[in-house]
């Protein structure tokens, strides 16, 4: 059930077990008789077919190409081919840092706010059955934790928790010992206190429209990362198939907050769309802010003072 390798560009560290799993795996099982081939190309070599005879380090299982381990000369392009399905990866194998327990280029950075929940779990689902033991290191010093199969840290973050955490899985394969390292760079930051989210622009907007035409109602807000923005307009689903919420757009502000924009698209405007409230709401744990749009027929706009129109 391990997910396939969908990323087209992959960087790995020399000396570790590694695998590529193609993304038509379920299909491959259905067509057992179909020819399935793995190829490599690098530099002067064009499309060399791979098989266990090409290298003692390579193994092929169903949907997976395994390296035991991957080495610098494995750098190159890899292809999986089956009937008219092809998948390609570009593999870059980098040197291991011999002076550290991890390689800087293979570090995942995470920012955690002080006093917030902080968790590190050492798991590797693909090699799970082969793993003998797993150790967790902080700044290359081994942490003494109870569980040596899946060491875990779960706590409220303190500034002292900052550092490089490396999960090292030890496993045996064909009588040889291998290890796989996954490192996190944890930075602990001050509590970034939340703002009260606010919708931008007037709270009530009359929009002049023509029947049969389309309109886009744009709702913008300044909010926190975990706040949400959504449209509310009539409860019954499917009552108007011409109304669509577009994907929300978010841009981070220099202060670490978010500017969000969510568009409601109304196509082929009909009478039923006029003089009803289309509400946009931004919500947080601290409260909500709502802004309303009312569609008004252009012919009727003379009845409403000009300053209340948004277009």
């Amino acid at each position: 059930a391990e997910s396939c390798t969908s990323r087209p560009h992959i960087t790995v560290v020399e000396g570790e077990p590694f695998y590529l799993k193609h993304c038509s795996c379920s299909l491959a099982h259905e067509i057992e008789t179909t020819t399935k081939s793995w190829y490599k190309s690098s530099g002067s070599q064009e499309h060399v077919e791979l098989n266990p005879r090409s290298s003692s380090r390579i193994a092929l299982h169903d949907c997976v190409l395994e390296f035991w381990p991957v080495e610098l000369n494995d750098t190159g392009s890899y292809f999986f081919q089956m009937k008219n399905y092809t998948q390609k990866w570009k593999l870059n194998v980098i040197r291991r840092n011999k002076h550290s327990c991890f390689t800087e280029r293979q570090v995942t950075s995470k920012i955690v706010e002080v006093k917030k929940f902080f968790q590190i779990t050492c798991e590797n689902s693909y090699y799970q059955t082969l793993v003998n033991s797993t150790s967790l290191y902080k700044n290359c010093k081994k942490l003494l934790l109870e569980n040596n199969k899946n060491p875990t840290i779960k706590k409220n973050a303190e500034f002292e928790d900052q550092g490089y955490y490396s999960c090292v899985h030890f496993l045996h394969h064909n009588g040889k010992l291998f290890n796989i390292t996954k490192t996190f760079n944890i930075t602990i930051v001050e509590d970034r206190s939340n703002i009260v989210p606010v919708l931008l622009g007037p709270k009530l907007n009359h929009v002049a429209v023509e029947l049969g035409k389309n309109v886009r109602l744009n709702c913008s807000a300044l909010l926190n990362e975990e706040d949400v923005i959504y449209w509310m307009f009539g409860e019954e689903n499917g009552s108007d198939p011409n109304i669509h919420e577009e994907k929300e757009m978010r841009i981070m502000t220099p202060e670490g907050k978010w500017h969000a924009s969510k568009v409601l698209r109304i196509e082929n405007i009909g009478e039923s769309n006029l003089n009803v409230l289309y509400n946009c709401t931004v919500a947080s744990t601290g409260g909500t802010d709502t802004k309303s749009f009312i569609l008004v027929r252009k012919a009727d706009m003379a009845d409403i003072p000009g300053h209340v129109f948004t277009r």
Partner: nanobody, 114 residues
């Protein structure tokens, strides 16, 4: 403090189904409730909501595949997810809609992959 506990997620193949549950420590009788999701590298979005009277609303991407329901006696909201697609992969959360949010629960991870 109100608590929301989501459950029912898991790993499922494309085309498969899951039923998520959300148990809350407050009475939901008079509340609009919704299911939100946050995909990898994305922001949290409302995908389905249900009014106190049981009227429902879904975003286009899940219409016809997801069904939200509620059991006021158990203070629980459900999301039946059918014909799942890889793009439905996300952490799913429930919360109040049209009023201040309750503190977010841990969510339940849904992974759709072959």
């Amino acid at each position: 403090e109100v608590q929301l506990v989501e459950s029912g997620g898991g790993l499922v193949q494309p085309g498969g189904s899951l039923r998520l549950s959300c148990a809350t420590s407050e009475s939901i009788f008079s509340l609009n409730m919704g299911w939100f999701r946050q995909g990898p590298g994305k922001h949290r979005e409302l995908v389905a909501r249900i009014s106190p009277a049981g009227s429902t609303y879904y975003v286009d991407s899940v219409k016809g595949r997801f069904a939200i329901s509620r059991d006021n006696a158990k203070n629980t909201v459900y999301l039946q997810m059918n014909s799942l697609k890889p793009e439905d992969t996300a952490v799913y959360y429930c919360n109040r809609v049209n009023t201040a949010l309750a503190p977010w629960g841990q969510g339940t991870q849904v992974t759709v992959s072959s």
